[in-house]
């Protein structure tokens, strides 16, 4: 339930934050889950715990596994799990999908690429940036704080961008790299009041109790690059992230461009292990842009399993 995936490369630094950390200053104990062995806090160890952070300096493939963190107080302990995977360095240039952080999109007016996870590290500017393994050079590229700015973005700027920086721990330096894809949105076009293609207004979606269910919110906003265009799901009028039910998550789909050239967005709502109480909720697919907001409401109903007679 309170688990987070983290990954890194061997011989690089990796720092992981306890998924259950709330306020700073609380005592946090770390354990290697498979053996229940306590992670030391002494910094002379290659892997050590430092409050809410677990540090691999540097990481080794054998460090892969699940780590338990317990945020302690006399009246309320809170437990989280960090699922850590350390990969061998690739000899070629390709960065495999499992090492990629979330994709970001840019346009001529907005082309910031943030370096993932950098806030966990003790680093100093400037960052080094690479595109498809080539060091970025030229006046169009500006490394600013923890992000890269590209001037006059063109479609050719799409690709995989890697940030590289040095983490300093007690005078010792460790390399860290992180990669994410960057896509470029077309500037030409127009925007319309959002049109929701799915779901239909007041649609009833049949689901089976105990099974998983997916709801797709799909809307089109015009042609070309869309500013402030978004699709999202709400539960009982509350954002999914604020509703706080881990079984119900939304996952951004691909930008779609239909044959008529319209720019559309998908948002998939995934409900794991559907429960009776999920049938009581109101699911709203919201599509919004500068023109306004359109809402389609979906409710779930129980799908009765078909009787099979011999």
């Amino acid at each position: 339930k309170f688990s987070k995936q983290s990954w890194g490369l061997e011989n690089e630094a990796l720092i992981v934050r306890c998924p259950r950390q709330g306020k700073p200053s609380y005592t946090v104990d770390w354990y290697y889950s498979q053996t229940n062995k306590s992670i030391p806090t002494q910094e002379r160890n290659r892997v050590f715990a430092s409050g809410q952070l677990l540090k691999f300096l540097p990481a080794a493939v054998a460090d892969s596994g699940i780590y338990t963190c317990i945020v302690r107080s006399p009246t309320f302990n809170r437990t989280g799990y960090a699922n850590v995977t350390i990969y061998k360095k690739q000899s070629d240039c390709n960065v495999p999908d499992y090492l990629m952080y979330s994709t970001v999109s840019g346009s001529e007016k907005n082309s910031k690429i943030y370096c993932p996870t950098i806030d966990l590290y003790n680093w100093t500017a400037p960052l080094e940036w690479f595109k498809n393994c080539q060091a970025l050079q030229g006046s169009r590229y500006r490394a600013h704080k923890s992000f890269l700015v590209i001037d006059n973005v063109m479609t050719e700027d799409a690709g995989d961008y890697t940030c590289k920086f040095i983490h300093n721990e007690n005078g010792a330096n460790y390399s860290v790299t992180a990669t994410r894809s960057f896509t470029v949105k077309d500037e030409q076009g127009f925007s319309l009041f959002p049109v929701i293609g799915a779901p239909a207004q007041n649609e009833i979606k049949e689901v089976e109790i105990g099974k998983n269910a997916n709801l797709t919110c799909s809307a089109c906003f015009g042609k070309g690059t869309q500013f402030l265009a978004a699709v999202l799901w709400q539960l009982n009028g509350t954002k999914i992230t604020d509703f706080g039910e881990p079984r119900i998550q939304q996952e951004e789909g691909q930008n779609q461009s239909f044959s008529n050239g319209l720019a559309c967005l998908d948002m998939v709502l995934r409900i794991a292990d559907v429960k009776e109480e999920d049938l009581l909720l109101q699911y709203d697919c919201l599509a919004l842009n500068l023109h306004g907001l359109r809402r389609h409401t979906v409710r779930l109903s129980r799908k009765n399993p078909i009787d099979h007679h011999s």
């Epitope: 945020v71 006399p74 009246t75 309320f76 509703f243 706080g244």
Partner: antibody
Framework: QVQLQESGPGLVKPSQTLSLTCTVS?????????WDWIRQPPGKGLEWIGY???????YYNPSLKSRVTISVDTSKNQFSLKLSSVTAADTAVYYC??????????WGQGTLVTVSS | DIVLTQSPASLAVSPGQRATITCRAS??????????MHWYQQKPGQPPKLLIY???NLESGVPARFSGSGSGTDFTLTINPVEANDTANYYC?????????FGQGTKLEIK
């Protein structure tokens, strides 16, 4: 944004059971944290009644334990307080709140319950 | 139960001056390197608001004029400088064990 709102009768007769409900919006109460009831007699200080954790475990103030039940209605994202055999000394503003670790970081506005015949 | 005794019961301070409120616990609320004492502010007609947790940590969004200190059984909330809108009741609360208990409160008035 997490919001809590208390509801229930403002007047309860002596020896009866006080029943209050706290409706939580912006967060699922079964996901995490502990969900408290605290009361404050008019012009007096705060008294912790007890809480129920996201896991369903309950912890009560021993001074009230024999009379208190805190429960959760997950379908409505609500938690409730029942206090039996009330007397005039139970007249207070009753607050519901969220406890993260040790501290109550979100509170309802409170509801005044008067015990009187 | 751990009994928390606040002093003074009330005080009046001029704007720009320092206000100091103390809270004494009937037994130590410190263990494993942390002190499980917290401070709240309650303005008339409002619920309490968390100011300080673990004796000295400022809650997010609370002005740096508020600070906490202490360990073991003796704790202090300091407001420096005091402002006009600091008029309120202030409560300490411990979480060293169950039941959680509050101090009886200190009323701060601004002259």
């Amino acid at each position: 944004q997490v919001q809590l709102q208390e509801s229930g009768p403002g007047l309860v007769k002596p020896s009866q059971t006080l029943s209050l409900t706290c409706t939580v919006s912006g967060y699922s109460i079964t996901s995490d944290y502990a969900w408290d009831w605290i009361r404050q007699p008019p012009g007096k200080g705060l008294e912790w009644i007890g809480y129920i954790r996201y896991s369903g475990d309950t912890y009560y103030n021993p001074s009230l334990k024999s009379r208190v039940t805190i429960s959760v209605d997950t379908s409505k994202n609500q938690f409730s307080l029942k206090l039996s055999s009330v007397t005039a000394a139970d007249t207070a503003v009753y607050y519901c709140a969220r406890t993260m670790m040790d501290t109550m970081d979100y509170w309802g506005q409170g509801t005044l319950v008067t015990v009187s015949s | 139960d751990i009994v928390l005794t606040q002093s003074p019961a009330s005080l009046a301070v001029s704007p720009g001056q320092r206000a100091t409120i103390t809270c004494r616990a009937s037994k130590s609320v410190s263990t494993s390197g942390n002190s499980y004492m917290h401070w709240y502010q309650q303005k008339p007609g409002q619920p309490p608001k968390l100011l300080i947790y673990l004796a000295s940590n400022l809650e997010s969004g609370v002005p740096a004029r508020f600070s906490g200190s202490g360990s073991g059984t003796d704790f202090t909330l300091t407001i420096n400088p005091v402002e006009a809108n600091d008029t309120a009741n202030y409560y300490c609360q411990h979480s060293r064990e169950f039941p959680l208990t509050f101090g009886q409160g200190t009323k701060l008035e601004i002259k």
